[in-house]
């Protein structure tokens, strides 16, 4: 978690900074959304609990050819302790529910904002 912050970071980034940067990236995606995000692609909904970073990455990694979420995918990989590849699913997915990427991002953003406000970074 402390190695987050993007490829250009000069050194380790505190967890609070990493989470803040992920939130700000999700805000950018939400604010800059003009056409349907990722052409309206659908992803598995996830339970926003412990392990959600990996679950979120597992969902989003199945969206290909969407430059708008590439940075988010990279940032989420820094929060996830194991390597995630397309087609991989954890028990945290709500496997009977698919939602649009835009809604997924909105839900994730709200949850992360709550965690950040409460000072829960890990």
């Amino acid at each position: 978690l402390t190695c987050l912050g993007g490829f250009a970071s000069p050194g380790p980034v505190p967890p609070s900074t990493a989470l803040r940067e992920l939130i700000e990236e999700l805000v950018n995606i939400t604010q800059n959304q003009k056409a349907p995000l990722c052409n309206g692609s659908m992803v598995w909904s996830i339970n926003l609990t412990a392990g959600m970073y990996c679950a979120a990455l597992e969902s989003l990694i199945n969206v290909s050819g969407c430059s708008a979420i590439e940075k988010t995918q990279r940032m989420l990989s820094g929060f996830c302790p194991h390597k995630v590849s397309a087609g991989q699913f954890s028990s945290l997915h709500v496997r009977d529910t698919k939602i649009e990427v835009a809604q997924f991002v909105k839900d994730l953003l709200l949850h992360l904002k709550k965690l950040f406000r409460e000072g829960q970074f890990n």
Partner: antibody, heavy 119, light 107 residues
């Protein structure tokens, strides 16, 4: 246009419970968060708590044990209840809309406020 | 809790003058700072959020700057309608906290 309006009793007796209603228009409670802020006469502003757009709540830890926030989305109303009122709870109580699509929490629209006296 | 310290407590300015109000956070809040104006008997009104972003409808003579722990609000070309109390607010961590306010009067 965006509007918020607080309503509730102007006078509450000590040890009683305060119940306030914030009725909103021009936006949906499922898309925006609603915050509660109070201001004692001649004093500064104190954040009380928030009703998140998904129905969750967060509170100022100083008030948490006495406070509850709920909502009725069909009526576009948010409710604040605060128990065990004391004279120091005398204040103008505001509900305000949160900026929401931003990384920070700020208040972009405010109600006109309701003055509550504890006596 | 994050403490927000505002200065000065009050100030008076002449018409057309430029004034600055400072706000100091007790810890780093990035750029998560907002400014409000409150007139007597009225609700606060948002002027600036995210340190420097002007809220719709707010005159461009208002500007904000700073980052980390030190912030300022600048009002260029003081007008009669600028009289009131100004508050800063951090939107970084719960509980959200406000400065104690700066009363601005027309000289």
């Amino acid at each position: 246009q965006v509007q918020l309006k607080e309503s509730g009793p102007g006078l509450v007796q000590p040890s009683q419970t305060l119940s306030l209603t914030c009725t909103v228009s021009g936006f949906s409670l499922t898309n925006y968060h609603v915050q509660w802020v109070r201001q004692p006469p001649g004093k500064g502003l104190e954040w009380m708590g928030v009703m998140w757009s998904d129905g969750d709540t967060s509170f100022n830890s100083v008030l948490k044990s006495r406070l509850s926030i709920s909502r009725d989305t069909s009526k576009s109303q948010v409710f604040l209840k605060m128990s065990s009122l004391q004279t120091e709870d005398t204040a103008t109580y505001y509900c305000a809309r949160d900026g929401t699509i931003a990384a920070m929490d700020y208040f972009d629209y405010w109600g006109q406020g309701v003055m509550v006296t504890v006596s | 809790d994050i403490q927000m310290t505002q200065s000065p407590h009050s100030l008076s300015a002449s018409l057309g003058e430029t004034v600055s109000i400072e706000c100091l956070a007790s810890e780093d809040i990035s750029n998560y700072l907002a400014w409000y104006q409150q007139k007597p008997g009225k609700s606060p009104q948002l002027l600036i959020y995210h340190t420097s972003r002007l809220q719709d409808g707010v005159p461009s003579r208002f500007s904000g700057s700073g980052s980390g722990t030190q912030f300022s609000l600048k009002i260029s070309n003081m007008q009669p309608e600028d009289e009131g109390v100004y508050y800063c607010q951090q939107g970084y961590r719960f509980p959200l906290t406000f400065g104690s306010g700066t009363k601005l009067e027309l000289k």
